[in-house]
């Protein structure tokens, strides 16, 4: 990896080894100010592989609310507006980092956790395996 | 929000107010063990709105490497394998949390940051604005 020259103004830390505990400021800096506010707002409905968004809430996690996409159909919507099984709707998944309260119910102590979330759906050509 | 009963075994913290600094264990717990290994592995190529993945590296960020999707075409791939501009390939975007080293170059001090990443692409019906 890339070695980072240490800033002499860094806070002290006792343990330099992994697994390590670090200080994190939860005052979130949002880098998304210049993004198009419409973004993917209505793509879930206009897509040929439309999806619904389900609210997943967990007070022991930060962020506590995550939205999960579920594809509406197994097939994709064709030009006639019908579900066509010659194509497949599939979820696009991404691993994201969240903070898990550890020990449980502690407001100021967390552990990083990787979770897999479905962000939306896309329409793919199926892999066809014919019987010999 | 939901109030969480405080665990008496929690570490002490001086500042109980937001913005607050918390302790985070960077030994990542991976909750994705039972997921289908096939996942989105080749969807980027098989999709009617295919995309390329671009590596975004920033040593001041944790995770330092994030993969960004860029749609290959403005239109979508039709049944003949051609790009059809009656439909649009659009990126599915998601806000994710990352840790930003703060002050810069400090190995043990971070600030939460929200960034917008493109995870993949989906094919949507365009919104047609007719001239009056």
């Amino acid at each position: 990896g890339i070695t980072i020259p240490r800033n002499p103004g860094c806070p002290n830390s006792e343990d330099k080894n992994f697994p390590r505990t670090v200080m994190v400021n939860l005052n979130i800096h949002n880098r998304n100010t210049n993004t198009n506010p419409k973004r993917s707002s209505d793509y879930y409905n206009r897509s040929t592989s439309p999806w619904n968004l389900h609210r997943n809430e967990d007070p022991e996690r930060y962020p506590s609310v995550i939205w999960e996409a579920k594809c509406r159909h197994l097939g994709c919507i064709n030009a006639d507006g019908n579900v066509d099984y010659h194509m497949n709707s599939v979820p696009i998944q991404q691993e994201i980092l969240v903070l898990r309260r550890e020990p449980p119910h502690c407001p100021n102590s967390f552990r990083l956790e990787k979770i897999l979330v479905s962000v939306g759906c896309t329409c793919v050509t199926p892999i066809v395996h014919h019987v010999a | 929000g939901i109030t969480i009963p405080r665990n008496p075994g929690c570490p002490n913290s001086e500042d109980k107010n937001f913005p607050r600094t918390v302790m985070v264990n960077l030994n990542i717990h991976n909750r994705n063990t039972n997921t289908n290994p096939k996942r989105s592995s080749d969807y980027y190529n098989r999709s009617t709105s295919p995309w390329n993945l671009h590596r975004n590296e920033d040593p001041e960020r944790y995770p330092s490497v994030i993969w960004e999707a860029k749609c290959r075409h403005l239109g979508c791939i039709n049944a003949d394998g051609n790009v059809d501009y009656h439909m649009n390939s659009v990126p599915i975007q998601q806000e994710i949390l990352v840790l930003r080293r703060e002050p810069p170059h400090c190995p043990n001090s971070f600030r939460l940051e929200k960034i917008l990443v493109s995870v993949g692409c989906t094919c949507v019906t365009p919104i047609v604005h007719h001239v009056a």
Epitope: L74, N88, P126, H129 | N36
Partner: antibody, heavy 120, light 111 residues
């Protein structure tokens, strides 16, 4: 308890249009299910004809696509089947059925079926 | 269109004995999302079909545990561990990975 009930004429003349309605009780047709039409010719197996989903999207059997239309009336909690240009081969028991649509995609409730005979 | 082929077409079984029905599809039933949408239904004489098994091996609620499903890809099996009199009827496999289709049915009767 969910119930689905087919209704419509039991006799249709060749070349005419067969029309059936399914009335759903105990479940809104706009909740997360697909509403199917499946038929069974006398003494034969089952044939899927098509469905309309909770969101109003339809899907049809490719072999029947040009002749079949499925629609719904959410105010009456009903969905309907129209099959045009019928022949004697369309004589069958017609079932309406609810399909669990939340990553199961299997029919979980069937109507009792209605026999439609195509004859002049 | 996917062709579902069941065997045997007729299955005489002694009460209390096991029974097994095979279903083969002309194409793999694994969807691009990794799931397999293969289901089983029972149709008793003079009745509508009734749900049994969904997605290869999951029993619908209320279905006795003597019914079990297995298989993958293109080859699937429905097993009844001990046949009872009420199990008489026609059993259909069905797939919804592609445009939905049904097998031609297997008639189970008591010897």
């Amino acid at each position: 308890q969910v119930q689905v009930q087919e209704s419509g004429p039991g006799l249709v003349k060749p070349s005419e249009t067969l029309s059936l309605t399914c009335t759903v009780s105990g479940n809104s047709i706009t909740s997360y299910y697909a509403w199917n039409w499946i038929r069974q010719p006398p003494g034969k197996g089952l044939e899927w004809m098509g469905y309309i989903t909770y969101s109003g999207t339809t899907s049809y059997n490719p072999s029947l696509k040009s002749r079949v239309t499925i629609s719904r009336d959410t105010s009456k909690n009903q969905f309907s089947l129209k099959l045009s240009s019928v022949t004697a081969a369309d004589t069958a028991v017609y079932y309406c059925a609810r399909e669990e649509y939340d990553d199961i995609y299997a029919v979980d409730y069937w109507g009792q079926g209605t026999l439609v005979t195509v004859s002049s | 269109i996917i062709v579902m082929t069941q065997s045997p077409l007729s299955l005489p079984v002694t009460l209390g004995q096991p029974a097994s029905i095979s279903c083969r599809s002309s194409q793999s039933l694994v969807h691009s999302n990794g799931n397999t949408y293969l289901h089983w239904y029972q149709q008793r004489p003079g009745q509508s079909p009734r749900r049994l098994i969904y997605k290869v091996y999951n029993r619908f609620s209320g279905v006795p545990d003597r019914f079990s499903g297995s298989g993958s890809g293109t080859d699937f099996t429905l097993k009844i561990s001990r046949v009872e009199a009420e199990d008489v009827g026609v059993y259909y496999c069905s797939q919804s990975t592609h445009f939905p289709t049904f097998g031609q049915g297997t008639r189970l009767e008591i010897k």
